[in-house]
Interface confidence: low
């Protein structure tokens, strides 16, 4: 694997200044694959082509994420450089068979996340799961896990049901989560930061 | 508090332009994209385009790309909505809106929406 | 572009009635679904974000559902201030689109 990143970048960094602008503001609109999330806009936007790259494998994984850069491409009307890394990544042994979809998984990053390293306490301590599930729901939560969460008794078993979910997230789903956290129990976080 | 207010009704001759102002107050300007969306009487809305005034980018609804230019100054938090090519079909109200753009989270809607300004296309 | 279908066209409530309104998309929007409420000569208000989350300020008798498609604003006792147009708009891809609006009116 590497193949499909590394034409990712070769493609992006042939981009002028504005055509890497126009690449970000369509990427926010293409139609993606059921089970992936959009990178959010305000991180996206200020992104170079090497973090950019980074974020589209660690959000949609190389095969997908290649495909998907090329669609965004052949829509601003680059066909040549569209073919070119649809070629590049064809030529890597590895990649998905068409139609399978790949799970989004968890970016490439040191060390564990907030959320996973404080789990149990977050599980015993958090009191606002409502709140997080509202402020998840439809971005990283669908509307069966929403419910399935919502069914639970006690909010430690509410937590402890929408931990079942966090291994399928990538890093910035569970950033969504902290910051949820962040504004409804900012002492709890504080607290466990200094911990 | 937040506040966009728009400038005042506009009445104009078919095949001439009209420049619209939506002054932003009680927040950072650069911090929010600004919207235009239009309403024509007893009708739906209509997204225009949007401006980050950050930096000028722009986005428009293509069937209002020839209409509709959007700038923004930030100097005094103000974005405009030039309009051409006037015909009766232009005839609506103007609502500038705008859309929390935060790094955690892309926030596509629209929270504060201004006054509106009334544009009437007659001759 | 993605369009919006809102139903019914016009809805006549009595006040303390519970009402829903319905918003279908040509295809799947993923819960990048908004509700506005538009009271006659006034500005368009957000009353639900992303399908189902509330909006500070929003009584909490306006709550949101649904997902793919279909969605659904529901009131719950209806006020007299609540009275007025109330559109949806999607914001999957772009353009923005906005549904037709429903009127909901006094019976």
């Known amino acids: 694997m590497g193949r499909a990143r590394d034409a990712i970048l070769d493609a992006l960094e042939n981009l002028t200044a504005e055509e890497l602008k126009k690449f970000k503001l369509k990427l926010l609109s293409v139609p993606l694959r059921e089970g992936y999330g959009r990178i959010p806009r305000g991180a996206l936007l200020s992104m170079d082509a090497l973090d950019l790259t980074d974020k589209l494998v660690s959000f949609y994984l190389e095969t997908y994420g290649a495909e998907l850069t090329a669609n965004v491409l052949r829509d601003m009307g680059l066909q040549e450089m569209a073919g070119q890394l649809q070629a590049a990544t064809h030529q890597g042994s590895g990649a998905a068979p068409a139609g399978i979809q790949a799970p989004p998984q968890s970016a490439a990053k040191p060390g564990l996340h907030f959320i996973d390293q404080h789990r149990a306490a977050l599980i015993a301590r958090v009191t606002n799961v409502e709140w997080l599930l509202d402020a998840l729901y439809g971005k990283v939560l669908t509307d069966e896990q929403y419910q399935a969460v919502r069914a639970e008794p006690t909010n430690p078993s509410k937590m402890r049901k929408l931990f079942s979910f966090t291994p399928a997230w990538n890093w910035t789903c569970k950033d969504l989560l902290l910051q949820a956290l962040r504004e409804s129990q900012s002492y709890l976080v504080e607290d466990l930061e200094r911990s | 508090q937040v506040q966009l207010q728009q400038s005042g009704a506009e009445l104009v001759r078919p095949g001439t332009s009209v420049k619209l102002s939506c002054k932003a107050s009680g927040y950072t300007f650069t911090s929010y994209w600004m919207h235009w969306v239009k309403q024509r009487p007893g009708q739906g809305l209509e997204w225009i385009g949007g401006?980050?005034?950050?930096?000028?980018?722009?986005k428009y609804n293509q069937k209002f790309k020839a209409k509709a230019t959007l700038t923004a100054d930030t100097s005094s938090s103000t974005a405009y909505m030039q309009l051409s090519s006037l015909t009766s079909e232009d005839s609506a109200i103007f609502y500038c809106?705008?859309?929390?753009?935060?790094?955690?989270?892309?926030?596509?809607?629209?929270?504060?929406w201004g006054t509106g300004t009334t544009v009437t296309v007659s001759s | 572009d993605i369009v919006l279908t809102q139903s019914p066209a016009t809805l006549s409530v009595t006040p303390g009635d519970s009402v829903s309104l319905s918003c279908r998309a040509s295809q799947s929007i993923s819960n990048n679904l908004h509700w506005y409420q538009q009271k006659s000569h006034e500005s368009p208000r957000l009353l639900i974000k992303?399908?189902?989350q509330s909006i500070s300020g929003i009584p909490s008798r306006f709550s949101g559902s649904g997902s793919g498609t279909d969605y659904t604003l529901s009131i719950n006792s209806v006020e007299t201030e609540d009275f007025g147009m109330y559109f949806c708009q999607q914001s999957n891809n772009w353009p923005y689109t906005f549904g037709g609006g429903t009127k909901l009116e006094i019976k």
């Open positions: 992303y399908t189902s």
């Open positions: 809106a705008r859309e929390e753009a935060s790094t955690v989270v892309a926030h596509w809607y629209f929270d504060v």
């Open positions: 401006i980050d005034p950050s930096d000028s980018y722009t």
